[in-house]
């Protein structure tokens, strides 16, 4: 059908909570395009109409609520005026008591899921809440160990939880809560965080933590386009440097002649006392030589590594 | 460091009151829970309730209700439980435990011994 | 009111042995639940937190694992300090139970 696949990394979900997922891929949704959402390769579009459970709203895709069954591989379909691109995303969906957080030891957790305060400075959690413009959300409440949080330390604004002269009893597990609106029904939405404390290192010198990849395999069928994120969360005076490196050369060194491996343009969001960047890796088309290669992402002094390799034969 | 430091033994006759304090330090003691336990002599641990020191906000479990006060002076950082209408099997060690997270830090633990 | 039914009530075990004991919850607490260990005369130490989690200072022959609402506390090799009784601590919601505790006696 002519359309180039593009494959993006697990997303893990809440069983009997709402979700939703855009399907913008930068530079591809720039233009004018249209977006349509099909499930696990079928031919049929996911429904767009508004009080089915599972629909399309605008580019993105909206569980009301997500379910156990719902696990699967959803495609968003990109078309502009001469291309066409497929977007793979894994939705994992797991069953989460309401004021957990962790989630069943599964690797690879977004920073979503993981935070960290900064100890003695005024810093700030956040409530990760990413729904389209017809989802309305209430005001949010937040949780430590199952207990509202409460005290002259924090204040709720808006999407985050403010602390202020934070100490080492800050450490432990929170939940955001939230209800969202959609067509006059009422959802609730709760998000689990892991919270750590860091001590600032003197001196600036600071050692960046890379939130993925976490040193792990990626399956990935031969000829088609991957994209794979470095996520770092670094002091916000940080000088560390961020790339893609292979055989210990930048990839943009590396493959200088065919350009087929890429870094992409770093980006950032700042947060009140640190910085979370993201870096890119794009193969425009995986060859048989991109295997068992431990394709490295460097952070300062930290380092963590991807190593693609082909989907097992299915017998099937 | 967090401590939590309790009040002495005491020895009280059945019918009478007993008020148990737990001072607290080296974190925001406005900011978590406090909790309370108790452990009859060779039992095992029963929770009883707990009080937030910022509101006052108490739950207690329900067969403490009406014999249970929980209340907080934020001056001393001191958390108080006070226990009525005692009886025979209210001799027991109590603890306070702090929720900075979930029951982190404890109380050395106070003997309360009813008797005739 | 979750009911916590731990197991064994009573163990006899060598220095060395690996050590395995077990609380079931009576409904849904995802992960929070503590391991506590308290020698005699002592007030409870909290070694597990939210099921997995070591507390700083303890040893790493202690371990924390959940299957559904079956919780396990693994000591992979028992030493001489580690004879005590072991409770865990549901606090998903409250009021909070504990288990009825599982004392480690030298064999």
């Known amino acids: 059908d002519g359309c180039k696949d593009i494959f993006m990394k697990n997303e893990i979900l809440s069983a009997s909570q709402p979700f939703a997922f855009n399907c913008t891929f930068p530079p591809i949704t720039s233009g004018e395009v249209s977006v349509t959402w099909y499930k696990n390769s079928s031919k049929i579009p996911v429904s767009k109409i508004i009080q089915s459970r599972i629909h399309q709203d605008e580019t993105w895709i909206l569980f009301l609520p997500m379910e156990w069954g719902d696990s699967g591989v959803y495609q968003c379909v990109i078309k502009g005026r001469d291309s066409c691109h497929r977007i793979h995303v894994n939705l994992t969906v797991f069953e989460k008591h309401w004021c957990d957080t962790s989630i069943g030891g599964l690797p690879n957790l977004s920073d979503e899921y993981k935070q960290i305060l900064h100890l003695g400075k005024d810093d700030s959690l956040t409530c990760h809440l990413h729904f389209p413009k017809s989802c309305v959300l209430g005001p949010i409440k937040w949780y430590k160990d199952c207990n509202e949080i409460k005290g002259e330390r924090f204040t709720v604004l808006e999407t985050r939880l403010l602390v202020s002269n934070v100490s080492a009893e800050d450490r432990g597990n929170y939940a955001c809560q939230a209800i969202l609106t959609h067509s006059g029904k009422q959802y609730e939405v709760l998000n689990g965080i892991t919270v750590s404390i860091t001590e600032r290192a003197g001196y600036g010198g600071s050692v960046p933590k890379i939130i993925y990849p976490k040193n792990h395999s990626i399956e990935v069928q031969l000829g088609t386009t991957l994209i794979v994120d470095c996520n770092v969360t670094d002091t916000k005076d940080n000088t560390n440097l961020r790339c893609w490196r292979v055989n210990n050369t930048l990839v943009d060194d590396y493959y200088d002649e065919s350009k087929r491996i890429r870094e992409g343009v770093e980006t950032h969001v700042s947060f009140r006392e640190h910085n979370l960047y993201t870096v890119n890796i794009t193969f425009l088309e995986v060859k048989m030589e991109d295997y068992g290669l431990p394709f490295m992402c460097h952070a300062g002094v930290s380092t963590a590594y991807i190593i693609l390799q082909l989907p097992a034969p299915d017998f099937r | 460091q967090v401590q939590l430091v309790q009040s002495g033994a005491e020895v009280k006759k059945p019918g009478a009151s007993v008020k148990v304090s737990c001072k607290a330090s080296g974190y925001y003691f406005t900011s978590y829970w406090m909790n309370w336990v108790r452990q009859a002599p060779g039992q095992g641990l029963e929770w009883m309730g707990m009080?937030?020191?910022?509101?006052?906000?108490?739950r207690l479990a329900q067969k403490f209700k009406g014999r249970v006060t929980m209340t907080v002076d934020k001056s001393t950082s001191t958390v108080y439980m006070e226990l009525s209408s005692l009886r025979s099997e209210d001799t027991a060690v109590y603890y306070c435990a702090s929720s900075t997270t979930a029951f982190a830090y404890w109380g050395q633990g106070t003997l309360v011994t009813v008797s005739s | 009111d979750i009911q916590m039914t731990q197991s064994p009530s009573s163990l006899s075990a060598s220095v060395g042995d690996r050590v395995t004991i077990t609380c079931r919850a009576s409904?849904?607490?995802?992960?929070?639940l503590n391991w506590l260990q308290q020698k005699p005369g002592k007030a409870p130490k909290r070694l597990i937190y939210?099921?997995?989690s070591l507390d700083p200072g303890v040893p790493s022959r202690f371990s924390g694992s959940r299957s559904g609402t079956d919780y396990t506390l693994t000591i992979s090799s028992l030493q001489p300090e580690d004879f005590a009784t072991y409770y865990c601590l549901q606090y998903a919601s409250s009021p909070y139970t504990f288990g009825q505790g599982t004392k480690v006696e030298i064999k």
């Open positions: 939210a099921t997995s």
């Open positions: 409904q849904d607490i995802g992960n929070a």
């Open positions: 009080i937030h020191p910022y509101d006052s906000e108490t």
